[in-house]
Interface confidence: low
């Protein structure tokens, strides 16, 4: 998953500014890049530490700029290193100046095991002294002086990976800052060979792509993608995926590749030479220009590209028909994803031709680990691969990358997965109140372990005893009434909180023990509440009779209608009244009891009643007489409530008369508000008065009522009241 | 570091309005409870006011005065005190709710005064 | 509404003494009361809560004690920045979230 390149610029050293950049494309590492000098490969190089900088123009880029005054602190071996998961992947470059009186061939010469190779120096200039060649630092090998040829060459019959290495030449009187290097890479494997016994078949690696020993994958060439390295990148691009962009006028002259091994240095395609600064010849394309085109039908051929296939035509050479390979793009893959930690399925899909198939969609872990489909479909014009990550935890938060590499191209997309820890209320929750059958719970919701914003929040609850199932309620306030429990029950209660998106559910937080009271008895029977005097009433009931032996009594609450004034009263059991005293003349209190043992018991309905007054009560009010005939008349009236009215009297006599002659209607009680008398006399005027009596007298009325009955003929009359003051 | 750093606070008239604002910082602003507690010159703590996920609740004395409300986006906790009158008068803190009070700001003086 | 009441309301004592301060609620309140000290001119800051677990960074020589209606806040050896006001605060019935009217703790 780590795309390492290592850019030597212009690797033969003049009085020019040079430079070494490793980048890191298309990957985000967790340890920074490295760039050292190979001591392995060269030992008695210069000592000088480097001076490592971003490279401003990428993000994941390192450089080290040596100014031409330097030239001569240059000369030796180098490497890029970067991490993931632990491992290190490390790519080696030379530097040598470009006066040495050797050159190599190339920079770097990869072989198979057991092939037949040889190391070629160029000698450029001449001198009266014997050649020397060393590997790593140290002799091997010596030609007189007489005998050096214009190629000076090492000749190894049957390569084995113990030879590889750095190679030097020299003339015997000079010294690192005058050699040429060339470094051998030997293949773990027999040509087209891999695997831990070499015993697997390589890919066929296109456009000189090599086969990686130990993963059996193509490392392509600068310019190539691809699983096979069959599709040429854009212009002037290079990496695994041709992200990355060769920002010179010239493309990528100049630029000398270094990819991890097996692979070595190269230059981009469509340049050769040491330095990468000379054109491919025409008919030639590729990495160092050694690639010939032979293409078909009269194709194009492009030194960047190799053929460039009519429409309906592809392969390396156009030699082949069919459908134009589309490189894979990966869709419907958002730049951020927020999971909960636990079970998560990642999906990647892609489209492309061919469409990518299973082995060829991968998934990698921000730690460089890489994940393979689990699951697989296509349909016409996508590929779905299913991933599964049996527990995604915080620390896997990070960049991921759908990555898809078909012979048509690669693709990566990196996205952003941020795993959140599920919430999980740190304290138990609280009850508040409970009763017989119900508990009033504060949840205490907060504060919480895990992230939130909580979606939703559910309260647990169950039976202690009983092997019931967990029941729950969805929540929405902090202050919850659970109902219908059963009473002398010990309950356990706990909270689950729920954050959004799937799997949101946290595990339930502390739990809370908590036992129902016993069912309360039913209140007292045939409550009555009377006013006893002034300043007491009389509440009584029937005895009570309770089913257990449990000791009970009567609690009587009773609080002022008029004033805020309650009092609780605690009555033995045996009693059956209480007389509620230290009260208000005049004035309403309501009163309601319950039995209580341990258990407290159910209120009755409140009762209502008046203390006897200290005053006089006020004369009735909207006194009416109506519905007159010639013998009858109704009258009616109303009375101010809190006076302890006990009867009202209603005194009559025809105008005129003695008052010893007046008639006395007594109405004994007080709720009637009209009365009709009867028997008088047609056409006479009658002088009506109205009282009301209470326990401390009668009213005194203002003025009289008068009443005229009609002629025994004529139909009822209302008299709105005329009045005579007496 | 926990930090909650109250602003709003002023000199006003009886009957007029100010709104508190808290800044909160160094821990995760919306999955607490915020609340505000004042303190009136010499006198003890009173809880004002305080907003729990959905839920707010209020001191009988501000109940229908006072407004408490948060900004998860940009971790600011409000009051909006409407109908100011003198007994309001005292230094405003606001405080990370847990049923008690973990941590608070500064505080910020609001005086009622004709 | 549930009242706290605190004693004493002013404690003189020297640095190295025993303090005492105690709150008592007018209800059953559980376990649920936290302590407050406040130094003059600044912020409360919390020191109990639970009624007995110490907040972060509160040192040792504070402790706290009881359940039901009464409760206890103990500084078993006081230094100079100890003296300051403490209060006490329930959470077991709100709204309202109600305080004690103070302890304040000065050097005899």
């Known amino acids: 998953a780590m795309d390492l390149i290592l850019i030597n610029s212009l690797p033969l050293v003049s009085d020019a500014e040079t430079s070494l950049t490793c980048i890191a494309s298309g990957w985000r590492p967790h340890e920074p890049i490295t760039i050292g000098r190979d001591f392995e490969a060269l030992m008695n190089q210069h000592q000088d530490p480097l001076e490592v900088t971003q490279d401003v123009t990428r993000e994941w880029a390192k450089k080290v700029v040596w100014k031409r005054e330097k030239a001569s602190k240059i000369n030796g071996a180098y490497f890029c290193e970067g991490r993931v998961r632990g491992e290190a992947i490390r790519i080696r470059t030379m530097k040598m100046r470009q006066q040495a009186s050797f050159l190599p061939a190339t920079l770097t010469m990869t072989v198979d095991k057991g092939d037949n190779v040889n190391i070629s120096f160029k000698k450029v200039l001449i001198k009266e002294e014997d050649a020397v060649i060393y590997k790593n630092g140290s002799f091997i090998h010596s030609v007189p002086r007489h005998e050096v040829p214009d190629i000076l060459e090492v000749h190894l019959p049957h390569a084995q990976p113990q030879d590889a290495g750095v190679y030097s030449a020299r003339y015997i009187g000079g010294n690192l800052f005058t050699s040429a290097f060339t470094r051998l890479i030997v293949r773990r494997c027999e040509a087209q060979k891999w695997g831990p016994e070499c015993n697997h078949l390589c890919t066929a690696c296109m456009n000189n792509g090599v086969c990686h020993e130990d993963t059996g994958e193509c490392i392509c060439p600068p310019g190539f993608m691809g699983r096979t390295c069959e599709k040429a990148c854009e212009l002037h691009t290079f990496g695994r995926t041709c992200k990355e962009r060769c920002s010179g006028q010239e493309g990528c002259k100049s630029y000398v590749f270094c990819l991890p091994d097996p692979y070595g240095c190269s230059c981009a395609t469509g340049w050769k030479g040491l330095q990468c600064n000379e054109a491919c010849h025409p008919g030639f394309y590729g990495p160092d220009c050694k690639l010939r085109c032979s293409c078909n039908n009269g194709e194009m051929c492009d030194r960047f590209q190799g053929c460039l296939c009519s429409p309906g035509w592809q392969g390396l050479q156009c030699e082949r028909e069919g459908i134009q390979r589309m490189t894979p793009k990966i869709v419907d893959l958002p730049d951020h994803i927020e999971v909960n930690s636990g079970k998560f399925n990642p999906i990647c899909k892609a489209s492309g031709w061919p469409l990518p198939t299973n082995e060829e969609m991968t998934l990698v872990k921000p730690d460089g680990t890489v994940l393979h489909p689990k699951d697989f479909n296509h349909t016409d014009h996508f590929s779905v691969a299913i991933f599964t990550i049996h527990r995604i935890l915080p620390p896997d938060s990070g960049v991921w990358v759908c990555s898809v590499n078909t012979v048509a191209g690669m693709v990566e997309k990196p996205f952003n997965i941020s795993v959140k820890v599920l919430p999980k209320p740190l304290n138990a929750p609280n009850v508040i109140d409970t009763g017989h059958n119900f508990a009033v719970i504060n949840i205490s919701s907060e504060p919480y372990f895990g992230d939130g914003p909580i979606k939703s929040k559910k309260l647990l609850y169950k039976p202690v005893n009983h092997y019931e199932a967990w029941q729950h309620i969805q929540v929405t306030n902090e202050i919850v009434t659970l109902n219908y429990l059963e009473p002398r029950t010990e309950y356990e209660l706990c909270v689950q909180l729920v954050r959004r998106g799937e799997g949101g559910e946290g595990h339930p937080g502390p739990v809370r023990r908590f036992t129902t009271a016993s069912i309360g008895l039913p209140p007292p029977r045939g409550l009555n509440l009377l006013p006893k005097s002034q300043t007491t009433l009389n509440l009584t009931w029937q005895p009570i009779f309770p089913s257990s032996e449990d000791d009970f009594y009567v609690e009587v609450e009773r609080r002022s209608v008029q004033k805020s004034d309650q009092q609780n009263i605690k009555v033995p059991g045996n009693l059956t009244s209480v007389l509620l005293n230290n009260l208000h003349p005049r004035e309403q209190y309501v009163v309601r009891a319950r039995v209580n043992t341990k258990a407290q018991g159910e209120w009755s309905e409140d009762l209502t009643a008046w203390t006897l007054s200290d005053i006089l009560p006020p004369q009735p009010e909207n006194i009416k007489i109506s519905n007159i005939t010639h013998s009858s008349a109704v009258i009616s009236w109303t009375i101010l409530d809190g006076y302890s009215i006990s009867s009202i009297t209603i005194r009559y006599k025809v105008q005129g008369k003695n008052e010893d002659q007046h008639v006395d209607v007594k109405i004994k009680n007080a709720t009637i508000t009209q009365y009709q008398l009867k028997g008088l006399e047609p056409e006479t005027a009658y002088q009506v008065d109205i009282f009301a009596e209470n326990n401390i007298g009668s009213s005194n009325p203002a003025f009289s009522h008068e009443l005229v009955t009609l002629p025994e003929s004529q139909a009822p009359a209302d008299l709105g009241g005329g009045k005579m003051l007496l | 570091d926990v930090q909650l750093v109250e602003s709003g606070g002023g000199v006003v008239r009886p009957g007029e309005s100010l709104t508190l604002s808290c800044v909160a910082s160094g821990f995760t602003f919306s999955s607490y409870g915020m609340s505000w507690v004042r303190q009136a010159p010499g006198e003890g703590l009173e809880w004002v006011s305080a907003?729990?996920?959905?839920?707010?609740f209020y001191a009988d004395s501000v109940k229908g005065r006072f407004t408490i409300s948060r900004d998860n986006s940009k971790n600011i906790l409000y009051l909006q005190m409407n109908s100011l009158r003198a007994e309001d008068t005292a230094i405003y803190y606001c405080a990370n709710w847990n049923s008690f009070f973990d941590y608070w700001g500064l505080g910020t003086l609001v005086t009622v005064s004709s | 509404e549930i009242v706290l009441t605190q004693s004493p309301g002013t404690l003189s004592l020297s640095p190295g003494e025993r303090a005492t301060l105690t709150c008592r609620a007018s209800?059953?309140?559980?376990?649920?009361v936290a302590w407050y000290q406040q130094r003059p001119g600044q912020a409360p800051r919390l020191i109990i809560y639970?009624?007995?677990n110490r907040a972060n960074d509160v040192p040792d020589r504070f402790s706290g004690s009881g359940s039901g209606t009464d409760f206890t806040l103990t500084i078993s050896s006081l230094e100079p920045e100890d003296f300051a006001i403490y209060y006490c605060?329930?959470?077991?019935?709100?709204?309202?979230?109600?305080f004690g009217g103070g302890t304040k703790v000065e050097i005899k």
């Open positions: 907003i729990n996920g959905g839920s707010t």
């Open positions: 639970d009624a007995t």
């Open positions: 605060q329930q959470y077991n019935n709100w709204p309202p979230l109600t």
């Open positions: 209800q059953h309140v559980n376990t649920h």
